[in-house]
Interface confidence: medium
């Protein structure tokens, strides 16, 4: 399976909400011993690799934001922890999973990574990730709403296969 990032760049005004999205593509094993660990974290765009560094998003780690479920099941993070930080990660039946960030500030600008780990018999068998950039702007040059820029199909950084 693969992870695709429909948009590689999100440009948003301060105070707006944004939903960053990744999509799980390809056949997904629905066996009873197979589960999926999905999560989000911040990173830095390294010279060679993207998403190797795992930083918290608004003080929530990838462990805090993770979803763990079988196949294309729907899931979302615990509301109390997420809402305190203005965050929620969610996953639907169609392979889409997302993180919503509310009331954006300039400090939210940066590189965001989604990660999916396929786990069989408690071993992480396959791992795929996607990267996207969030730019939060303020002042007269800031857009009135979030503007999204589609990923190039040639951008190998944004689609990784297991």
């Amino acid at each position: 399976f693969k992870v695709a990032t429909p948009y590689s760049l999100y440009v948003c005004p301060e105070g707006q909400n944004v939903t960053l999205t990744c999509r799980l593509l390809g056949p997904v094993d629905k066996g009873h011993d197979v589960t999926f660990y999905k999560t989000w974290y911040r990173s830095s765009r390294g010279e060679v690799q993207t998403c190797s560094e795992r930083r918290p998003i608004r003080n929530l780690t990838f462990q805090d934001l993770h979803l763990h479920h079988g196949g294309h099941q729907a899931a979302n993070t615990s509301h109390d922890l997420a809402q305190r930080h203005g965050l929620e990660s969610a996953s639907d039946h169609h392979g889409n999973f997302s993180i919503t960030m509310r009331n954006l500030t300039l400090l939210d600008s940066g590189l965001y990574c989604c990660l999916v780990v396929e786990i069989r018999h408690h071993h992480s068998e396959h791992r795929v990730h996607g990267a996207m950039e969030l730019q939060v702007q303020t002042g007269k040059d800031a857009p009135s709403n979030c503007v999204v820029y589609p990923s190039s199909s040639q951008d190998s950084e944004n689609i990784t296969a297991a």
Partner: antibody, heavy 120, light 107 residues
Framework: EVQLVESGGGLVQPGGSLRLSCAAS????????MSWVRQAPGTGLEWVSG????????FYADSVKGRFTISRDNSKNTLYLQMNSLRAEDTAVYYC?????????????WGQGTLVTVSS | DIQMTQSPSSLSASVGDRVTITCRAS??????LAWYQQKPGKAPKLLIY???SLQSGVPSRFSGSGSGTDFTLTISSLQPEDFATYYC?????????FGQGTKVEIK
């Protein structure tokens, strides 16, 4: 039974190079991130470098960045650490360690260690 | 990088004693803290991860607690095989960092 066995340590002069290996067995190697952690004589533990289980994404401590390179050969169940431009302060026992679960950074299995001595 | 500070750096205790070691992080790490035991000439052994989760095969006399910046490892009744050096480690973010260690010696 999970086993990690390091090799390749030894005496090397300052500025020299050394390549450490860590042979893994008893589990599905590709399923786990791996790290090198070192311990200088009589001191504490210092994480050196880590590598992703599938993508070879690597990350390094500032003290070794640009001098050390971590890699893995999943077909051989082996982790490597190429150490160049070695300094006296790199003298330590080097352990390879497995990250415990999915994307975590705690280390549930360690090798026995291999001693690297940098001295003229 | 997140700095980890352990106290005490060493302690003397007797078999059967209750022993407590503390670890402080330079910034909040939620509950992402691990504890290791190391004996001379041996590799570290994972005792506890996620602040309070006991690693498989580790005796129940070991327990961990804490959240945020302050954490504790407790050995409820010290056994002869527990004399060793103990390290805390944050597994909150890259790079993972260790405390300087606490040596538990025989009184």
């Amino acid at each position: 039974e999970v086993q990690l066995v390091e090799s390749g340590g030894g005496l090397v002069q300052p500025g020299g190079s050394l390549r450490l290996s860590c042979a893994a067995s008893g589990y599905i190697f590709t399923g786990y991130d791996m790290s090198w952690v070192r311990q200088a004589p009589g001191t504490g533990l210092e994480w050196v470098s880590g590598i992703d289980g599938h993508f070879d994404s690597s990350f390094y401590a500032d003290s070794v960045k640009g001098r050390f390179t971590i890699s893995r050969d999943n077909s051989k169940n082996t982790l490597y650490l190429q150490m160049n431009s070695l300094r006296a302060e790199d003298t330590a026992v080097y352990y390879c360690a497995r990250s415990s679960y999915a994307v975590d950074l705690a280390f549930d299995y360690w090798g026995q260690g291999t001693l690297v001595t940098v001295s003229s | 990088d997140i700095q980890m500070t352990q106290s005490p750096s060493s302690l003397s205790a007797s078999v059967g004693d209750r022993v407590t070691i503390t670890c402080r992080a330079s910034q909040g790490i939620s509950s992402y803290l691990a504890w290791y035991q190391q004996k001379p000439g041996k590799a570290p052994k994972l005792l506890i991860y996620a602040a309070s989760s006991l690693q498989s095969g580790v005796p129940s006399r070991f327990s961990g607690s804490g959240s945020g910046t302050d954490f504790t490892l407790t050995i409820s009744s010290l056994q002869p095989e527990d004399f060793a050096t103990y390290y805390c480690q944050q597994h909150y973010t890259t790079p993972p960092t260790f405390g300087q260690g606490t040596k538990v010696e025989i009184k």
